[in-house]
């Protein structure tokens, strides 16, 4: 994190994001100040907003697993910043935890 406050995602998006347009994801964890657990997917196009998703959903778990075994991008994704993340809801917290495919690849 760059030390800036993070707007928490309070509502899951109903929209699903195609796997091939996602660059990475980060976790929003209630233990770090946000009211709900969430996965925020970062699109490849930096101009597009993050998508807030329910970590219990099958499609979210599939996409996370896919990203987990993909090599980490050379250029690190921006950390927690007020001008990143969707939706903006005014609730400030420290609930941003970056998990940009740092896990050991688990592919077959």
């Amino acid at each position: 994190s760059d030390g800036g406050a993070q707007d928490c995602c309070l509502k899951y998006s109903q929209r699903k994001i195609p796997a091939k347009v996602v660059r990475s994801y980060r976790k929003q964890e209630p233990s770090l100040g946000c009211s709900i657990p969430a996965i925020l997917f970062l699109p490849r196009k930096r101009s597009q907003a993050e998508l807030c998703a329910d970590p219990k959903e099958l499609w979210v778990q599939q996409l996370m697993q896919h990203l987990d075994k993909t090599p980490t991008p050379r250029k690190p994704v921006q950390g927690c910043r007020k001008d990143r993340g969707v939706p903006k809801n005014g609730k400030k917290g420290k609930g941003c935890k970056r998990t940009e495919q740092s896990q050991t690849p688990k592919g077959p």
Epitope: K16, P18, A19, K20, K56, E57, L58, W59, Q61, Q62, L63, Q65, H66, K69, K106, G107, P108
Partner: antibody
Framework: EVQLLESGGGLVQPGGSLRLSCAAS????????MSWVRQAPGKGLEWVSA????????SYADSVKGRFTISRDNSKNTLYLQMNSLRAEDTAVYYC??????????WGQGTLVTVSS | SYELTQPLSVSVALGQTARITCGGD??????ASWYQQKPGQAPVLVIY???ERPSGIPERFSGSNSGNTATLTISRAQAGDEADYYC??????????FGGGTKLTVLG
């Protein structure tokens, strides 16, 4: 050794019910989504249903929606498929398969379900 | 509903290259996988994420996916490659679809 073992298949009359089980071993069951895939005699593969890691999120093929229910018991490392209102066209070998991302990397050997009067 | 179309059969001479296609509306925007099935046996994953090979699968197996067609390529075909091959893909629902399957015959 990573293994999936299906059971519960057999002969059932049209309109009847059957519950299939898939016992998983050799891996952390609750870290994977699971699916059922079937294959009618002499035909191709048909995906039937999938379930998320904790069992919260489920998905079904149109052909079984409203008749089949997928579930899992992570404490028993077991996947289930409850099949109701069975039809002749449900006759198939039913495989359970482990999902990882967008593919199935481990398959069971299958259990045969025959729907006939 | 989404459909994937494969040729019913493909023949290849021993040692030559076989290509099996899988057609679907914008399948290139999804990740395709390929499964090999021999008579009386369960399917085996041979290609995942369009072009990745699981450990234990020979380098002779490769995949590609763009536009409306995914392709499985088997170079230096061997008698042991004779089998049915199925492509598969998830859509965003998420529901999974398999192609109808292709019987590969190795001649000679």
């Amino acid at each position: 050794e990573v293994q999936l073992l299906e059971s519960g298949g057999g002969l059932v009359q049209p309109g009847g019910s059957l519950r299939l089980s898939c016992a998983a071993s050799g891996f952390t069951f609750n870290s994977y989504s699971m699916s059922w895939v079937r294959q009618a005699p002499g035909k191709g593969l048909e995906w039937v249903s999938a379930i998320s890691m904790e069992g919260y999120s489920k998905s079904y093929a149109d052909s079984v929606k409203g008749r089949f229910t997928i579930s899992r018991d992570n404490s028993k490392n077991t996947l289930y498929l409850q099949m109701n209102s069975l039809r002749a066209e449900d006759t198939a070998v039913y495989y359970c398969a482990r999902g990882y991302g967008y593919y199935f990397d481990v398959w069971g050997q299958g259990t045969l379900v025959t729907v006939s009067s | 509903s989404y459909e994937l179309t494969q040729p019913l059969s493909v023949s290849v001479a021993l040692g030559q290259t076989a290509r099996i296609t899988c057609g679907g509306d914008s399948i290139g925007s999804q990740y395709a996988s390929w499964y090999q099935q021999k008579p009386g046996q369960a399917p085996v994953l041979v290609i995942y994420d369009d072009n990745e090979r699981p450990s234990g699968i020979p380098e002779r197996f490769s995949g590609s996916n763009s536009g409306n067609t995914a392709t499985l390529t088997i170079s230096r075909a061997q008698a042991g490659d004779e089998a049915d091959y199925y492509c598969g893909s998830w859509d965003s629902n998420p529901t999974h679809v398999f192609g109808g399957g292709t019987k590969l015959t190795v001649l000679g």
